[in-house]
Amino acid sequence: QEFLLRVEPQNPVLSAGGSLFVNCSTDCPSSEKIALETSLSKELVASGMGWAAFNLSNVTGNSRILCSVYCNGSQITGSSNITVYRLPERVELAPLPPWQPVGQNFTLRCQVEDGSPRTSLTVVLLRWEEELSRQPAVEEPAEVTATVLASRDDHGAPFSCRTELDMQPQGLGLFVNTSAPRQLRTFVLPVTPPRLVAPRFLEVETSWPVDCTLDGLFPASEAQVYLALGDQMLNATVMNHGDTLTATATATARADQEGAREIVCNVTLGGERREARENLTVFSFLGPIVNLSEPTAHEGSTVTVSCMAGARVQVTLDGVPAAAPGQPAQLQLNATESDDGRSFFCSATLEVDGEFLHRNSSVQLRVLYGPKIDRATCPQHLKWKDKTRHVLQCQARGNPYPELRCLKEGSSREVPVGIPFFVNVTHNGTYQCQASSSRGKYTLVVVMDIEAGSSH
């Protein structure tokens, strides 16, 4: 007769590290010792005629257990396969590139350590909740990859890795483990350099706006801009409008920066850089300064007029050029009445990098001279009709400007000068027109002949 040795439970599934109660029983009418053959930690819990119960503890891996017993001069055995399921110990998405160019492929790499049975373990790579790849976990550790074409929409998207241990066929459910998400940053940086608008020349201690613009940048708000004049970083105001970035700064040249310089604009995004450079000459243009040896000269005195400017500047004073650039221009004159109010013009020319820059300056000479009454403007004999309106047109000149009064001889009667007045016969007579200033007096005799009007 064939006797059986039953092992229960048959082919159990349990969680790693768990315990299992195993019963071995036989219908063989024998009181023989039943042995449980296993490398697992076991303890005989109880036994009786034809049966033995064992407790297996700390079951960490798949195992085949066997019971054996002597029966009627032979040995009979029974077995059961233990399947252990273990959740992955580590599910980790490898770090993503710090910045990923749009339109280029990148690789998602997920590492899964432990987890069994492997045949029931699936690794899923996700963007948000969208499945990008689903693959079985094979080696230990399992590495699952997926190639993704980076798009603008991926900027800021979380990527993660999920494991699914499907123990549903065994009635134990679906065990899910998810890695910490990793955020992708994508970018577009055009190959073209930025547009840099800057002056060709910049005078020391003056300021000028500098603009740097780059189009087709994504995300423009993440870009970093560096604007500099030589090694002097400029404080830029950066503005984004859509995919366009504009940086504006004010460049102010210092005296120690004189000469050929560069304005640099760097736009950095995603660890890449685009650069524009423009040449700029920092120049110093002093003057021109026009000086008079005497700003207020006496008639007949010698006056020196000089014009000077900075180094390398060619000056021309009233059409007379200086001997050489950087040299002053001078002229001398004897001050005359006609020189009073005369303006002396100085033009300065500086060549900067092939361009000629011009500046002008002037000064006015004052000549002090005594009073005069111009006979041409002051008629010495006047014939006017009685009871008519007239103007005594007399003009005096002099520096300082004289006071002009016309007084009738032998009386204190004064006629207004340059103002219309009503003429009558009493105005008939000789007048002393006197121009007076601190520099003297000048008198001209004017005769007024008033013709009596006809009576009706």
Epitope: K33, A35, S68, Y70, Q75, T77
Partner: antibody, heavy 119, light 106 residues
Framework: QVQLQQSGAELADPGASVKMSCKAS????????MHWVKQRPGQGLEWIGY????????EYNQRFQDKATLTADKSSSTAYMQLSSLTSEDSAVYYC????????????WGQGTSVTVSS | QIVLTQSPALMSASPGEKVTMTCSAS?????IYWYQQKPRSSPKPWIY???NLASGVPARFSGSGSGASYSLTISIMEAEDAATYYC?????????FGAGTKLELK
């Protein structure tokens, strides 16, 4: 009749290994579990472990886990025990003994193999 | 592990005398086995399942006991009984032997 014939005496250097045999005859080798027992001169009996020749399953006394390795060859009905990393403490007589079942205990014993460890 | 303690370790008896030796277990066992060993010989099975005599063992030997306390008795000592007797259990791994009782002839 049942017989267990053990291999001859062994003289070994410290650190060496020895492998002794126990040839069974007179019964079906795969049915019965084969045990091994150590006896130092003038001392008692100490159980080393057993092998089930039918399944090659072995179970050891923890004290001998890293010292003894039990194997069996069904085709020649021979059980083997290898002792490794020998020291003077391993000098003893080693017996193989068949477990005849609960009703008999260790019912047949080999004549013993003497192992002497000496430099 | 279950420790078996045999007493006395050494005893002597005259022919015709009654001899009793004991074997106590550190925890309860279902049954024990006794083996006889003479100098330069392999051990021989003597008593199995606590009280059953192995084939060829004289009827003057008997075994008894239960739980943790067991004994082997020789009703009338004979010269051929001088030997060392070992008790053994296999309730759990490891299988263990007692240290033995050496019985000498007076």
């Amino acid at each position: 009749q049942v017989q267990l014939q053990q291999s001859g005496a062994e003289l070994a250097d410290p650190g060496a290994s020895v492998k002794m045999s126990c040839k069974a005859s007179g019964y079906t080798f795969t049915v019965y579990w084969m045990h091994w027992v150590k006896q130092r001169p003038g001392q008692g009996l100490e159980w080393i472990g057993y092998i089930n020749p039918n399944t090659d399953y072995t179970e050891y006394n923890q004290r001998f886990q890293d010292k003894a390795t039990l194997t069996a060859d069904k085709s020649s009905s021979t059980a083997y025990m290898q002792l490794s990393s020998l020291t003077s403490e391993d000098s003893a007589v080693y017996y193989c003994a068949r477990w005849g079942g609960n009703s008999y205990g260790l019912d047949y014993w080999g004549q013993g193999t003497s192992v002497t460890v000496s430099s | 592990q279950i420790v078996l303690t045999q007493s006395p370790a050494l005893m002597s008896a005259s022919p015709g005398e009654k001899v009793t030796m004991t074997c106590s277990a550190s925890s309860s066992v279902s049954y024990i086995y006794w083996y006889q060993q003479k100098p330069r010989s392999s051990p021989k099975p003597w008593i199995y399942l606590t009280s059953n005599l192995a084939s060829g063992v004289p009827a003057r030997f008997s075994g008894s006991g239960s739980g943790a306390s067991y004994s082997l008795t020789i009703s009338i000592m004979e010269a051929e009984d001088a030997a060392t007797y070992y008790c053994q259990q296999w309730k759990s791994i490891p299988l263990t032997f007692g240290a033995g009782t050496k019985l000498e002839l007076k």
